[in-house]
Amino acid sequence: GSVPPMVNVTRSEASEGNITVTCRASSFYPRNITLTWRQDGVSLSHDTQQWGDVLPDGNGTYQTWVATRICQGEEQRFTCYMEHSGNHSTHPVPSGNSHHHHHHHH
C-alpha cells in the first residue's frame, strides 16, 4: 500500500528583499513523488529550484524537499504542488513565520 506525505511549507529570510520558501514532504511511501513550485499557476523551471534527495526517514517511509527564492511580498503568487500515488495537492506559502502542515488521506 501507499502512505501519503505530510507536506510542510516554510519561509526564511534569504537576503534583503528576498525570502527562501521550502516545501518539505515527509513520511511517504513509495518513494516516487512530484514536488515543485508554481508562480501564478505556472511551473517554475528546474534552474530556479533546488531539490533535496529522496531519503529514507528511518520508518520505512521517505522525505524530500524543494526550495526556491522569491521576492518578499509576492508570497501569495507561489504554491507548492505535490503528486504522489495518484493523489495531488497544492500548498500556499504561509504568511509571516508560521508553518503550514497538511496531511493527505486516500
Epitope: N32, D47, V66, Y81, E83
Partner: antibody, heavy 120, light 107 residues
Amino acid sequence: QVQLKESGPGLVAPSQSLSITCTVSGFSLTGSGVNWVRQPPGKGLEWLGMIWGDGNTDYNSALKSRLSISKDNSKSQIFLKMNSLQTDDTARYYCARGAYYGKRWYFDVWGAGTTVTVSS
Amino acid sequence: DIQMTQTTSSLSASLGDRVTISCSASQGISNYLNWYQQKPDGTVKLLIYYTSSLHSGVPSRFSGSGSGTDYSLTISNLEPEDIATYYCQQYSKLPPTFGGGTKVEIK
C-alpha cells in the same frame, strides 16, 4: 502496461482548428502529467505543453495563444486543441507521459503519434 | 529558449563499433538532460535521463555523460536494432527543447 494512443483528423484545412485525443491506459491521469510533442516532416521534436495531475497546464510560450490542453480523468483521455492552423503545423503529434521526480523530469512512455496534414 | 545543438546530423558505423553522439546547449543546463531514440517507424523511447541514468529496460551498452553545456550519448557496441535517430533534450528552462537529432546508420 502503460500505453498512450493518439487519434486525430489526419487532414485539416488552413485557418481551421485541430483537435487530437490521447487515450491512456495502465496509469491514472490524476497522478501523472501528460505532454504533447510534435515533429514536422524531416525535422526535430518540439514540446507543445503539458497537463498535470490536478489539471493545471503549462504551454510553450511560442504557441500558447493557439493552444489548449484539457482532460477527462474518468475516460483516461487528454485533449489537444490548436487554433488557426497553417501549413507549417503539419506534423506528427505525440502524447507522452511525464515523470517528474525532483531533479529528474523525463518523458518515459510515448504514443505512436498521429499525423496531421494542413492543406486545402 | 535554450538551443540544443547536435552538430552531427548523421553518421555511419559498423556493427560492434563504439559510437558517440554529442549535444551542446546554448547555456549551462546543470545535467538536466535526457536522450531519446526514434526508430524509422517513428516510435520514440527514453534511453537516458538526468545526463547518465539508464532508463529501465534499456540495454547497458547505452551510456550518457557530460556537464555544463556539453553532453554525449555513447553506444559501446553497435547492434542492428540501434539504427535510429537520437535526440537530446534539456529541461533546465521551460520550454523543454530538443536537439536536431543524429541519425545512426550501418556502414
